[in-house]
């Protein structure tokens, strides 16, 4: 969490941003909030990016003002116009690109004053893993698959029964480049699986950590998966 204050001229207002991550090819949100104003026409929002000459986005007098918008963001940005009046200056970024990563500034002017805060935005690819029993294999085998990751993640297997065990000798992980030549499909196979146990396939890079669990008993198979972004710090 980054909290910034305005300085010179008028009074300062508090602006708060939260570091976040974008999943390339999907839409992302750059979060920013500020002390609200009662008049929308008095609010100016500017988003800037370090190393980019034009503005990322500008909103003033109740509407977008994109005459100075940088080419790399053209047609890809929007604020939540109906929420600006309550202090939400968050930016929606469409079709996140790897090159969108970097340091952004949310700069606000209201009738109360000015303020700004920076935000670190990471980009990559992350997806939920799915763990299945591989019935084609000669021994009891689990197969963990996740369709899109970047940068290349690490994959670690764990088991509820054999806590602390190292499964690297009985597992094999491969990374297959997807058609857009950036993200990769992750496939990890775990051999010599025992029944009545819960296994976890953990995939992690510097942006996200995802876990796929599978519980195999003689009568049923239960699956669960979850994904956590690693860098959500507020400023």
């Amino acid at each position: 969490l980054i909290i910034g204050f305005g300085i010179s001229g008028r009074h300062s207002i508090t602006v708060t941003t939260v570091a976040s991550a974008g999943n390339i090819g999907e839409d992302g949100i750059l979060s920013c909030t500020f002390e609200p104003d009662i008049k929308l026409s008095d609010i100016v929002i500017q988003w800037l990016k370090e190393g980019v000459l034009g503005l990322v986005h500008e909103f003033k007098e109740g509407k977008d003002e994109l005459s100075e918008q940088d080419e790399m963001f053209r047609g890809r940005t929007a604020v939540f116009a109906d929420q600006v009046i309550v202090g939400n200056a968050s930016l929606r970024l469409k079709n996140v690109q790897l090159t969108d990563a970097g340091t952004y500034k949310c700069y606000i002017i209201t009738s109360k004053g000015k303020g700004n805060a920076n935000l670190e935005y990471k980009t990559g690819a992350f997806s939920m893993p799915e763990v299945n029993v591989d019935y084609n294999a000669s021994s009891e085998t689990l197969r963990c698959e996740a369709p899109r990751w970047f940068p290349q993640p690490t994959v670690v297997w764990a088991s509820q029964v054999d806590q602390g065990a190292n499964f690297s000798e009985v597992s094999n992980t491969s990374f297959e480049l997807n058609s857009e030549n950036v993200t990769m499909k992750v496939v990890s196979v775990l051999y010599n699986v025992t029944i009545n146990n819960t296994y976890s396939c953990m995939i992690e890079n510097d942006i996200a950590k995802a876990t796929g669990d599978i519980k195999v008993t003689e009568s049923e198979i239960k699956r669960r998966s979850h994904l956590q972004l690693l860098n959500s710090k507020a400023s």
């Epitope: 800037l48 990016k49 190393g51 980019v52 000459l53 503005l55 700069y107 002017i109």
Partner: nanobody, 122 residues
Framework: EVQLVESGGGLVQPGGSLRLSCAAS????????MHWARQVPGKGREWISR????????SYADSVKGRFTISRDNAKNMVYLQMNNLRAEDTAVYYC???????????????WGQGTTVTVSS
Amino acid sequence: EVQLVESGGGLVQPGGSLRLSCAASGFAFSNYWMHWARQVPGKGREWISRISGDSESTSYADSVKGRFTISRDNAKNMVYLQMNNLRAEDTAVYYCARDRFGDDYYYGMNVWGQGTTVTVSS
């Protein structure tokens, strides 16, 4: 106050070279990315190149890639644009600009120099 003064423009033949310079003052030069852009009369400004404060990162528009080189000298508060193999379509007013991103940024801040004219003609 940010001040940027470009120089080095002139008339050059197709295939020729020019080196543009930009003298910066009024801010902590080495902390900022610097940019070059150009404008043909009647058209919008076109960004062409940028360089990070430590010179470790540079990038170029496709239209100038392989022909133009950006550099800087933080001791002298100078940024340069070496232009080789110039073409008629490179004719424009060339502007040096400071990155907006910084603690001193304010609404309406002028980050541009006044420009220097480059004419490529035989």
